[in-house]
Interface confidence: low
């Protein structure tokens, strides 16, 4: 901060702001009676030059005219783009320990006078909004710079609306707060931008438009749409618009789509009819304007509109499977199951299944609803039973599908050959078969099942199948395949009253178990040792287990022990060996084998025989 | 975030006047949806009117056909307050009245169905005595 000028004063030729190149006299003179005190001769006046409140310069060379004692006139040049401060002061150099004294200072803006600003361009958004114009200022002035924008129209309409900028903001954008109504549709307008600073001023080119040129509609807003009797396909959509709209775009799609359905509609006056939507299907849907048909702009697209179209009728045929199981000797368990519809086949909520197990000759039918997609009756095993189900919803009932309860497995001639279960991948397998070799009747189809081989898988889950047709011998199963989990797959071959089917094991990744089996007991019967054990817990198996191993050795013994290898069965839990010697104590342990590898041993568990050796 | 705290309400006999305010703080701006809703008890919220106002200034209102011509919206966007003018009041009039702001979903009723916007007040009471 300068005193006020008390001492003197500083005077800048040819003025304060000066164009970038140009050179600069400053003059700093004292005022009368002021000085050093005594002796004015030795009044020495020195130009500090400051950049951002830092001292850059002391422009003593500088100086190009010189009244000792009363004034001197420094010239400076190169100053750079900005506002640079100059400070006199006062030097009295017969005291050398006093500092020099200020006496006035004079700040220098040097800049370029403004460019014509271009590209200017205007809009109004919507018939309501206001004229709002934005244009390019340019280079930088490094000025204070004022920007003019003038709108003229018919009638010697005329408007203006002022902004500057600065170092601290830019001006290259003006509301005018003129709204252009409908009726001056063909009327042209001019618009033109002026810029002025202490450099200099120009002006743009006039900017000619018309209403329909900057007009930018509204969105369509209060978008709505009425289903012609609750149809799910056809519905009229409906919106709001300003009242000089002549086009719309429509837009909509499924919620989980990736691409729109496109639709223009060319006076729609705020009404179009949609015939080819999906029942029971959350869609979206959104409405662009424009007043002209072949100029103008779109607006923006209006707000989303999500709804669900109504339910029709399901299409669907489901997919059913069941299993059997004998009770006792006239009575059979009956599980039937079903896949749920697609929802382009559903085409709505499914409420209820409607099943119906029917005895062909004796004309027997039980019938129920069910919400699940399985049902299981209990039913005599004499007789030809068929089984159908369909699917209800709002609108109504998809055709029922009917199934021939056959048995599944019993036809040994029917049963596929060669079934292979390969690991593709971390989630799939693929099965692959040969036909039956002597089938006597031609194969329908065949059913691909598989379910995981774990405890209660039977009860507590569902199967999962695939229908495969005769002419295919391979299958890739996938749905609820998980690694590192052993499933049971059966190939079903069925015929219109029979049923053949081969069964094996499968996984899609495996590892070495993590454990081996825990041997529970050792009993000797008749000469032979008896060992008894626990499966390994179905978690550990990691896959499918090939067979088990039995080693012994006898306790002390530094040779290999000595194996035997088992198929591995889930049923089994126990297997006889009988090449131990009597009155000699054994170790004896188990593994388990994958395809992946052997686990470590179980437990050790030590016997010694006491019948004869074989 | 944005705050809306509604204001104004009140008793009046029919016919009289109430003006409603509806200040917005936090993130605030002018190009949004606002609008006032009521309800009476046992009824569901109903939209009353509203107001658009785009990124250039220009806007749009809207009324529900029972309050057309009695009563009037508006917002002063430097108080970034919404106002609801009301003359010639009814009985039927007698409502909670709600202040909302920011249409970001559109349903089948357009600006009248209340789930469609993100921001609500807690409401202001009217009561209309004949």
């Known amino acids: 901060n300068i005193d006020v000028c008390k001492l003197g004063t500083v005077t800048v030729q040819p003025a304060p702001v000066i164009p970038l190149g140009s050179a600069a006299n400053i003059s700093c003179s004292l005022n009368p009676k002021q000085g050093c005190s005594h002796y004015p001769s030795s009044n020495e006046l020195i130009l500090l030059k400051f950049v951002n409140d830092v001292l850059v310069e002391n422009l003593h060379g500088k100086k190009v005219h010189d009244h000792t004692g009363h004034s001197s006139t420094f010239q400076v040049t190169n100053l750079s783009l900005g506002m640079t401060l100059f400070v006199c002061k006062l030097n009295c150099s017969n005291s050398q320990k006093k500092p020099p004294v200020p006496v006035c200072g004079v700040e220098i803006s040097v800049g370029v006078a403004p460019e014509p600003p271009q590209n200017i361009s205007c809009v109004q958004e919507g018939e309501n909004g206001t004229v709002a114009c934005s244009w390019n200022s340019g280079k930088v002035t490094y000025l204070k710079t004022n920007y003019t924008l003038q709108l003229s129209g018919p009638n010697n309409l005329t408007c203006q609306k002022q902004c500057f900028s600065d170092n601290r903001q830019n001006c290259n954008r003006l509301d005018l707060g003129i709204n252009l109504s409908p009726d001056l549709a063909e009327s042209r307008f001019i618009v033109r931008v002026t810029a002025i600073n202490d450099l200099g001023n120009s002006s743009s080119l006039p900017h000619t438009f018309t209403f329909l040129d900057i007009v930018i509609p509204l969105p369509p807003w209060d978008i709505r749409i009425n289903f012609l009797n609750a149809s799910g396909s056809r519905g009229t959509l409906q919106w709001e618009d300003e009242g000089q709209v002549v086009l719309n775009q429509l837009r909509y799609q499924p919620l989980n789509s990736t691409s729109w359905n496109m639709v223009n509609a060319t006076n729609a006056k705020g009404k179009y009819d949609l015939r080819d939507l999906r029942p029971f299907t959350e869609y979206e849907f959104q409405i662009s304007s424009k007043l002209h048909l072949s100029g103008g702009s779109w607006s923006n697209w209006s707000e989303s509109l999500r709804t669900r179209t109504p339910e029709e009728e399901p299409v669907g045929i489901l997919d059913i499977w069941y299993m059997k199981q004998d009770i006792d000797y006239d009575r059979q368990q009956i599980s039937l199951f079903w896949k749920s519809l697609n929802p382009s086949e559903a085409r709505g909520k499914i409420l209820h299944y409607q099943v119906t197990l029917q005895e062909v000759t004796k004309k027997t039918t039980l019938q129920n609803t069910t919400r699940h997609t399985s049902w299981t009756r209990v039913i005599p095993r004499t007789g030809a039973w068929t089984a159908s189900v369909s699917a209800a919803n709002s609108k109504g009932a998809s055709a029922p599908t009917h199934i021939n309860i056959v048995d599944l497995c019993g036809t040994g001639l029917l049963a596929p050959h060669q079934v292979s279960a390969k690991s593709e991948n971390m989630d799939n397998i693929l099965v692959t078969w040969q036909p039956p070799k002597k089938a006597d009747s031609a194969v329908r189809e065949y059913i691909v099942e598989w379910r995981a081989l774990q405890p209660g898988s039977i009860t507590k889950f569902p199967p999962h199948w695939l229908r495969i047709p005769p002419d295919n011998m391979s299958a890739l199963i996938s749905e609820n395949i998980k690694p590192y989990i052993c499933y049971e797959i059966r190939v079903h071959a069925l015929s219109e009253s029979q049923g053949g089917c081969s069964s094996i094991r499968g996984d899609s990744k495996h590892k070495a178990p993590v454990s081996g089996p825990h041997i529970t007991a050792i009993t000797e019967k008749k000469e032979r040792l008896f060992i008894s054990w626990t499966h390994i817990p179905f978690p550990e198996q990691r896959g499918c287990i090939l067979h088990y191993r039995i080693y012994w050795k006898e306790r002390d013994s530094t040779a290999q022990p000595e194996l035997c290898e088992i198929q591995y069965r889930r049923s089994q839990n126990s297997h006889p060996i009988s090449s131990l010697q009597p009155r000699v104590t054994y170790v004896l342990w188990m593994t388990a084998v994958t395809a992946a590898g052997e686990s470590p041993q179980g437990n050790e568990r030590e016997f010694c025989p006491q019948g004869k050796a074989n | 975030q944005v705050q809306l705290q509604e204001s104004g309400g009140g008793s009046v006999q029919a016919g009289g006047s109430l003006r409603l305010s509806c200040a917005a703080s936090g993130a605030t701006n002018s190009n949004r949806h606002m609008g006032w809703f009521r309800q009476a008890p046992g009824k569901e919220r109903e939209g009353v009117a509203a107001?658009?106002?785009?990124?250039?200034?220009?806007?749009?209102?809207y009324y529900a056909d029972s309050v057309r011509d009695r009563f009037t919206i508006s917002q002063d966007n430097a108080k970034n307050t919404l106002y609801l003018q009301m003359n010639s009041l009814t009985p039927e009039d007698t409502a909670m009245y709600y202040c909302?702001?920011?249409?970001?979903?559109?349903?089948?009723?357009?600006?009248?169905?209340?789930?469609?916007?993100?921001?609500w007040g807690q409401g202001t009471q009217v009561t209309v005595s004949s």
């Open positions: 107001i658009y106002t785009g990124y250039t200034g220009g806007g749009n209102t």
């Open positions: 909302a702001a920011d249409l970001t979903r559109w349903y089948s009723g357009g600006w009248r169905d209340p789930r469609g916007y993100k921001y």
